[in-house]
């Protein structure tokens, strides 16, 4: 009696269980009562990443430099190419089909988390006692200068965008 289901890594065709092609190979011809499944390796720049019965291999992803992309990991016959973004850019989606420039943190904000190839810069406001006077994708908020430790006094208080201004003791008013 012909089978209604096949084992793992097999497929049912013409009331017969045939072996699937292994990753990195495509199907040329189904098995018969007398012959095994015929498979062929994928060509250059092609891949198949599962046990399959595909008659065509998939094209490797193209990391388009015009979209800010570069190759992170070269594809093989069994794996797709993995793209990432050029330095200073990050992917717009999980599939990383295009890139955008990392966000900079404005003055008054510091970098909480530096951007990666897949995530943007995370900024945070500088709290009292800290400042950032630059727009940067790397700089954290800096602590205000301690005038006291320099035997000076605060002449002008700091803000979230400016450091304190220290001056000599005798200029206290």
């Amino acid at each position: 009696e012909p089978p209604t289901a096949c084992r793992e890594k097999q497929y049912l065709i013409n009331s017969q269980c045939c072996s699937l092609c292994q990753p990195g190979q495509k199907l040329v011809s189904d098995c018969t009562e007398f012959t095994e499944t015929e498979c062929l390796p994928c060509g250059e720049s092609e891949f198949l990443d599962t046990w399959n019965r595909e008659t065509h291999c998939h094209q490797h992803k193209y990391c388009d430099p015009n979209l800010g992309l570069r190759v992170q990991q070269k594809g093989t016959s069994e794996t797709d190419t993995i793209c990432t973004c050029e330095e200073g850019w990050h992917c717009t989606s999980e599939a990383c089909e295009s890139c955008v420039l990392h966000r900079s943190c404005s003055p008054g904000f510091g970098v909480k988390q530096i951007a990666t190839g897949v995530s943007d810069t995370i900024c945070e406001p500088c709290p009292v006692g800290f400042f950032s006077n630059v727009s940067s994708a790397f700089e954290k908020c800096h602590p205000w200068t301690s005038c006291e430790t320099k035997d000076l006094v605060v002449q002008q208080a700091g803000t979230n965008k400016t450091d304190v201004v220290c001056g000599p003791q005798d200029r206290l008013r």
Partner: antibody, heavy 122, light 113 residues
């Protein structure tokens, strides 16, 4: 020990001004922020602003710009807050409190004055 | 400006009760550089100035009984009185000191049941 002693209660006419004082003892007055807070009758606390006596640097809550003016006299360790163009809505208890001491890590208000009641009434 | 929202606005409790007051900030008060939450709690009794209880969200001020504790991080904070004493009936305020202007919660009045 740290102490902040404020001037006594005031009754003022609408349109007039009042100057509330806060005398500090027991710490280095010039390098510690003096914070000013108000509390209208039956209401919560509202930060007005602050002054660093040694430098004269100030921070004002936008809401009180033009209403409150802070000054400080380091020779007497006294901070002042002047309230101008008084209206009935300015009736409140006004507190001074000590803020950061120059360490940049003590921004909370650890010592408070006893409060000054300012009543604005015609 | 950072808004501070306290709840409940009042709570009736008995001596010995555990009382919890919550405070929510409209933005995070946690600063990544020093991992500190810029939040304080104050107690105020009628006709008196407020008194500092807790700073940095969970550090008890010197002399404050250990039945008072603060917890939370980011935007959500809690003041807990583990066993309410007669002298604890008062109004409690949270306050942030992350950036100007400093703002307070609207207060929670703890009343005798």
């Amino acid at each position: 020990q740290v102490q902040l002693v404020q001037s006594g209660a005031e009754v003022k006419k609408p349109g007039s001004s009042v100057k509330v004082s806060c005398k500090a003892t027991g710490y280095t007055f010039s390098t510690s922020w003096i914070e000013w807070i108000r509390q209208a009758p039956g209401q919560g606390l509202e930060w007005i602003g602050s002054i660093l006596p040694g430098s004269g640097s100030t921070n004002y809550n936008e809401k009180f710009k033009g209403k409150a003016t802070f000054t400080a006299d380091t020779s007497t360790s006294t901070a002042y807050m002047e309230l101008s163009s008084l209206r009935s809505e300015d009736t409140a208890v006004y507190y001074c409190a000590r803020g950061d001491d120059g360490s940049y890590v003590r921004w909370y208000f650890d010592h408070w004055g006893q409060g000054t009641l300012v009543t604005v009434s015609s | 400006d950072i808004q501070m929202t306290q709840s409940p606005s009042s709570v009736s409790a008995s001596v010995g009760d555990r009382v919890t007051i919550t405070c929510r900030a409209s933005q995070s008060l946690l600063f990544s550089v020093n991992q500190k939450n810029y939040l304080a709690w104050y107690q105020q009794k009628p006709g008196k100035a407020p008194k500092l209880l807790i700073y940095w969200a969970s550090t008890r001020e010197s002399g404050v009984p250990d039945r008072f504790s603060g917890s939370g991080s980011g935007t959500d904070f809690t003041l807990t009185i583990s066993s309410l004493q007669p002298e604890d009936f008062a109004t409690y305020y949270c306050q942030h000191y992350y950036s100007y202007p400093w703002t307070f919660g609207q207060g929670t009045k703890v009343e005798i049941k």
